[in-house]
Amino acid sequence: LQDPCSNCPAGTFCDNNRNQICSPCPPNSFSSAGGQRTCDICRQCKGVFRTRKECSSTSNAECDCTPGFHCLGAGCSMCEQDCKQGQELTKKGCKDCCFGTFNDQKRGICRPWTNCSLDGKSVLVNGTKERDVVCGPSPADLSPGASSVTPPAPAREPGHSPQ
């Protein structure tokens, strides 16, 4: 026997109190699939959240963060304060990266500079709070008669996948 509720489309709910007829979702609620026995309450983007997509009867609202904050968690469940490059967010707010570490983004933590000597290379460009060191050729490669230096490949910005 077919469930009469299975005929209720998205944007409606199957009303137990009215002989299982399909009733439209009330304001501020939605059902994204058919056959639902309740509409769900729309997410509200308040405070540091702002509305990226309004709620409709068939889909939930989507939030992002106001300027100065960035999304964290599935579906932007949290907004975290941005810091400047060269800083990281701590419980006490944005703090400069310690010497020997860097952060080239407005989010995330300070990471140690690359240790060039581990790869047998020399430091070509010193690191800063905002940038990692650039490792050059190994000291042996710099001896007279060695082939010319090829510049290092640019580092890909972490946290971004290729387009």
Partner: antibody
Amino acid sequence: QVQLVQSGAEVKKPGASVKMSCKASGYTFTFYTMHWLKQAPGQGLEWIGYINPSSGYTNYNQKFTDRATLTADKSTSTAYMELSSLRSEDTAVYYCARSDGSSSKWYFDVWGQGTTVTVSS
Amino acid sequence: EIVLTQSPDFQSATPKEKVTITCRASSSVSYIHWYQQKPGSSPKAWISATSNLASGVPSRFSGSGSGTSYTLTINRVEAEDAATYYCQQWSSNPFTFGQGTKLEIK
């Protein structure tokens, strides 16, 4: 008859987490939404959030978004709430309450007996 | 969020007296629900959608109102009505409750 039976009292230290349960019986668990509410000693009622056991969809009071996690197990008709990073202000009775979403009125028609959580060092 | 303010906070009444509890919303709401809570017990569903009495609620109770002003009325109050009464809305997220009105029967 329709019943919501909640887990027993808990005593926790600040910074700890607590997970409480709410077992439903006497009705079809997935036809109703399950809400969680807080009542601090001598205070009024505060809505924490709800879960739709049918879909797993959750909606939270923004005040509790980062510390409360609601889940539901359809196989045992049980809803759970985990509260993390506990502090003294979390000392309260926590209720689960059923709402007939199909009435579209969001009215809590059946309540659990409450779980008392005490946060103390 | 919508703030619900109940008045009075505390009411003392004698049996057979008429009691009125008011719930005012900071902005317009579609309907109000009422709950009764006795000390040491869970709240109980009392009146839904402004005026529908929950199962088992005596007919001396009634509810009315619209927009920003709602009332719960007890026509001839009885000793068993001593409790705290809460109003609740969901016209806007989050669900909110009034602070409660404690009713004492002398």
